[in-house]
């Protein structure tokens, strides 16, 4: 009679994580008597996957009635496959004895596990940066298999080219991680911009995963200041305004200085938003020129988002306005941003 052969017909099997893997094995003879066992790997460190007669293998079931005496099909199904299950599986026939001895092994079936990458997480710099500066964004995704993966960067739909990507580990592993760093040059119009990291993998069936970062969390657009003197509102009164334009984020504090002395400090509240996401704000002072003998230097000083203050000054010519003799009464405040200077 021909010697028993152990046949594993599938050289390889690929299974998606979470599914069951069926590993086929048949023997060509009932002789010699002895059990079949399944192992992952070969050699002394091989891992027992299934023993017909003893042990605990809750994820393994036999495909046919493998315990029937005449049975020659020893295929198994392994449930809830994870990347850690990848490897080469051997169906091994033992000859009964004291102890049982290995008689013949199948050629092995390589199980590869397709595991989806995790949702990409995009993170930007810890501190805000201003337009014209280059900032780095990182994108990470984990737990995928096989190793082949494609990562792309976009800014507002436009593909970026300045990035570096690593897939770890370099050698064989049950699953892999990808890490990419992209460099982005900020512009003043980037408040509404988005940076997108897109990951494509065989497990995603052409529907890539995306991670996004809003540049609003990264950019700081410093304000431009303009101080102007409005036409005389009433006799001896001048309205001076400070236009704070195109700033982001909103956190802003404005201080009026009169000849270098602090006159009033206020925080930007009722701002107007521009189409590009930046903000404008205006503060004004009502100056009673009759209270001044000399010219007045008015300074609008702005501290934006914790940065060093920027300022703009305006010289108010007192001589240009006739003085009202003996008058040092305050003009009436007519707005929350108004201030009289004596």
């Amino acid at each position: 009679e021909e010697e028993l052969q152990v046949i594993q017909p599938d050289k390889s099997v690929s299974v998606a994580a979470g599914e069951s893997a069926i590993l086929h094995c048949t023997v060509t003879s009932l002789i010699p008597v002895g059990p079949i066992q399944w192992f992952r790997g070969a050699g002394p460190a091989r891992e027992l996957i299934y023993n017909q007669k003893e042990g605990h293998f809750p994820r393994v079931t036999t495909v046919s009635e493998s315990t029937k005496r005449e049975n020659m099909d020893f295929s198994i199904s392994i449930s809830n496959i994870t990347p850690a299950d990848a490897g080469t599986y051997y169906c091994v026939k033992f000859r009964k004895g004291s102890p049982d001895t290995e008689f013949k092994s199948g050629a092995g079936t390589e199980l590869s596990v397709r595991a989806k990458p995790s949702a990409p997480v995009v993170s930007g710099p810890a501190a805000r940066a201003t337009p014209q500066h280059t900032v780095s964004f990182t994108c990470e995704s984990h737990g995928f298999s096989p190793r082949d993966i494609t990562l792309k960067w976009f800014k507002n739909g436009n593909e970026l080219s300045d990035f570096q990507t690593n897939v770890d580990p370099v050698g064989e592993s049950v699953s892999y991680s990808i890490h990419s760093t992209a460099k982005v040059v900020l512009t003043r119009e980037d408040v509404h911009s988005q940076v997108i990291c897109e990951v494509a993998h065989v497990t995603l069936q052409g529907d890539p995963l995306r991670g996004t970062a809003n540049l609003s969390e990264t950019i700081r657009v410093p304000p431009t200041l303009e101080v102007t003197q409005q036409p005389v509102r009433a006799e001896n009164q001048v309205n001076v305004t400070c236009q704070v334009r195109k700033f982001y984020p909103q956190r802003l504090q404005l201080t009026w200085l009169e000849n270098g002395n602090v006159s009033r400090t206020e925080t930007a509240s009722t701002v107007t938003e521009n189409k590009d996401g930046t903000y404008n704000w205006m503060s004004w002072l009502l100056v009673n020129v009759s209270a001044h003998r000399d010219d007045v230097k008015l300074t609008c000083q702005v501290e934006h988002d914790g940065q060093p203050a920027v300022s703009k000054s305006h010289d108010l010519k007192v001589s240009a306005h006739p003085k009202e003799q003996g008058s040092n009464t305050a003009a009436e405040n007519t707005g929350s941003n108004e201030r009289n200077i004596y």
């Epitope: 091989r46 891992e47 027992l48 042990g55 605990h56 315990t67 005496r69």
Partner: antibody
Framework: EVQLVQSGAEVKKPGATVKISCKVS????????MHWVQQAPGKGLEWIGR????????KYAPKFQGRVTITADTSTNTAYMELSSLRSEDTAVYYC??????WGQGTLVTVSS | EIVLTQSPATLSLSPGERATLSCSAS???????LYWYQQKPGQAPKLWIY???NLASGIPARFSGSGSGTDYTLTISSLEPEDFAVYYC?????????FGQGTKLEIK
């Protein structure tokens, strides 16, 4: 549901023989090795031996070899463990287990003169 | 025969503490064949961890197993009152199969 139900407690005299049964349900006894384990009072677990009910092949621990006989009746889905030449140190709870995973409730055997 | 030596014989700890139980084999045991059982007074042993590191059904995730070759460990990250019991390691790599002498985990 897998269940292993053992026979009741036994009191034996030194030199006698005891035979404990383990009736299983929820699986076919032929499909698994059936093991027997001893636990003396306040002591640990000690493997006695096992049987392959499919062909009655047995393996025994050297300590029990010659005094123990493990058998199985596949028609009634029952395994048996017989221990002869009993001595006081054989006083113990005896457990059957299926393939190391499922255990019977235990049978107390007291050997006393 | 492979002799399994468990240490310590008794471990006195309080709920919430971390427990580390060791099992040392006199010769190498394949990790696939190293099991742990829990036993409480008057009860049959229960399979707790199989193949060194796999938790049996219903076993809480605070339990973990590790090791290879001759040294194996059962760890309980944060003890709960119901964890106090005797734990046995067991090898079925070669005949005769053997158990460790057990580690009694008791409340301090």
């Amino acid at each position: 549901e897998v269940q292993l139900v053992q026979s009741g407690a036994e009191v034996k005299k030194p030199g006698a023989t005891v035979k404990i049964s383990c009736k299983v349900s929820g699986f076919n006894i032929k499909d698994y090795y059936m093991h027997w384990v001893q636990q003396a009072p306040g002591k640990g677990l000690e493997w006695i031996g096992r049987i392959d009910p499919e062909d009655a092949e047995t393996k025994y621990a050297p300590k029990f070899q010659g005094r123990v006989t493990i058998t199985a009746d596949t028609s009634t889905n029952t395994a048996y463990m017989e221990l002869s030449s009993l001595r006081s140190e054989d006083t113990a709870v005896y457990y059957c287990d299926r393939g190391l995973a499922y255990w019977g409730q235990g049978t107390l055997v007291t050997v006393s003169s | 025969e492979i002799v399994l030596t468990q240490s310590p014989a008794t471990l006195s700890l309080s709920p919430g503490e971390r427990a580390t139980l060791s099992c040392s084999a006199s010769s190498s045991v394949s990790s696939s064949y190293l099991y742990w059982y829990q036993q409480k007074p008057g009860q049959a042993p229960k399979l707790w961890i199989y193949s060194t590191s796999n938790l049996a059904s219903g076993i809480p995730a605070r339990f973990s197993g590790s090791g290879s070759g001759t040294d194996y460990t059962l760890t309980i990250s944060s003890l709960e009152p119901e964890d106090f019991a005797v734990y046995y390691c067991h090898q079925w790599s070669s005949y005769p199969y053997t158990f460790g002498q057990g580690t009694k985990l008791e409340i301090k």
